[in-house]
Interface confidence: low
Amino acid sequence: QLPPGKPEIFKCRSPNKETFTCWWRPGTDGGLPTNYSLTYHREGETLMHECPDYITGGPNSCHFGKQYTSMWRTYIMMVNATNQMGSSFSDELYVDVTYIVQPDPPLELAVEVKQPEDRKPYLWIKWSPPTLIDLKTGWFTLLYEIRLKPEKAAEWEIHFAGQQTEFKILSLHPGQKYLVQVRCKPDHGYWSAWSPATFIQIPSDFTMND
């Protein structure tokens, strides 16, 4: 029977800068029941606080609701593991909410084949930003990436769309069924998961008339 091993805070994510969650990996349990507590203080403060919500984020997590989240300050946090034989502490982690945003995937992905007269046909892709993100405040710049591939192909073709919420793709294989997905990231943050795939059948007469 030993004191617990050193825990590690391995991930913190925020969907929208308004709330965030951090997760830790327990160290070895030393063969005894082990309690974990996360404590933190904000930059410019000396007061230590305990995690406000150990439930919402699931096991080994701490969730910071709106009233505990400030994007103006760095959070300095650590996890304490305690059993009957002693305690151990994780390394301090510095968390800036601005830099841990991982939005939900974009919504309302729509894909359409356009064949304008006397022009090259193209695939027109359109989407909406995730609901939780408020772009009007100017606090967020969302960047988008599209991926698509023929249904049976192994490789994805990636296109970077910048801040646009629509995109045109010209070079496609006629007669193929394509999968299309889109994802987004804040200007400094993490890519969202890919949106659910949308399927589109490319007509056989999708020809390139130069």
């Epitope: 930059e43 410019g44 403060e45 000396t46 007061l47 994007m71 103006w72 760095t74 300095i76 510095y94 601005t98 606090w139 200007d187 400094h188």
Partner: antibody, heavy 118, light 111 residues
Framework: EVQLLESGGGLVQPGGSLRLSCAAS????????NHWVRQAPGKGLEWVSD????????NYADSVKGRFTISRDNSKNTLYLQMNSLRAEDTAVYYC???????????WGQGTLVTVTS | QSVLTQPPSASGTPGQRVTISCTGS?????????VHWYQQLPGTAPKLLIY???VRPSGVPDRFSGSKSGTSASLAISGLRSEDEADYYC???????????FGGGTKLTVL
């Protein structure tokens, strides 16, 4: 070696404008907050403004709000202070400073003198 | 009004211990914000001397120490030396101003 080098100071008439620059070297500029702090001749330090790493957030002292604009170009490792509607009381040495975790100012430039007089 | 108040001057003889106070209010030091101290030698830019109330950056002699209690902070210099003659400023974030506050500065003279 961390270096901050201010430029752009000089003599200007009341109501005029100046743009100060601060060239940074010796560290990853985009990883730090940055500040402007000024010091009137024979007086103490007065914080003017700060800006976050990716320019998402800016703060200003009440005395300059609406007249001064802080900005940065991370590709050029340069901090700026656009000063409009200058007044005699803006006369000071202007320092740029690097901000660390609690945004404390850990390195300072040598300053550039701005003189506002008619 | 938010201010950090420091005595305008302080003095001591070589080898003595000198303390400089910095008094704030409930919107800055008393709110829980940490205090930083800067040293400005004549004709030079300020230099970070103490941060987060009592931490010395590398290269700062252990003759310099800081403390904080309630709405006040203090800087102590022991074993005073002639090269310590300088202006000393405290600084803290102020919640009501949403900005940094510097104390008025204390001119330290080594007699």
């Amino acid at each position: 070696e961390v270096q901050l080098l201010e430029s752009g100071g000089g003599l200007v008439q009341p109501g005029g404008s100046l743009r100060l620059s601060c060239a940074a070297s010796g560290f990853t500029f985009s990883s730090y907050w940055n500040h402007w702090v000024r010091q009137a001749p024979g007086k103490g330090l007065e914080w003017v403004s700060d800006i976050s790493r990716a320019s998402s957030y800016t703060n200003y002292a009440d005395s300059v709000k609406g007249r001064f604009t802080i900005s940065r170009d991370n590709s050029k490792n340069t901090l700026y202070l656009q000063m409009n509607s200058l007044r005699a009381e803006d006369t000071a040495v202007y320092y740029c400073a690097r901000g660390l975790d609690a945004r404390r100012m850990d390195y300072w430039g040598q300053g550039t003198l701005v003189t506002v007089t008619s | 009004q938010s201010v950090l108040t420091q005595p305008p001057s302080a003095s001591g003889t070589p080898g003595q211990r000198v303390t400089i106070s910095c008094t704030g209010s409930s919107s800055n030091i008393g709110y829980g914000y940490v205090v930083h101290w800067y040293q400005q030698l004549p004709g030079t830019a300020p230099k970070l001397l103490i941060y987060r109330n009592n931490v010395r950056p590398s290269g700062v002699p252990d003759r310099f120490s800081g403390s904080k209690s309630g709405t006040s902070a203090s800087l102590a210099i022991s074993g005073l030396r002639s090269e310590d003659e300088a202006d000393y400023y405290c600084a803290a974030w102020d919640d009501s101003l949403n900005g940094w506050l510097f104390g008025g500065g204390t001119k330290l003279t080594v007699l």
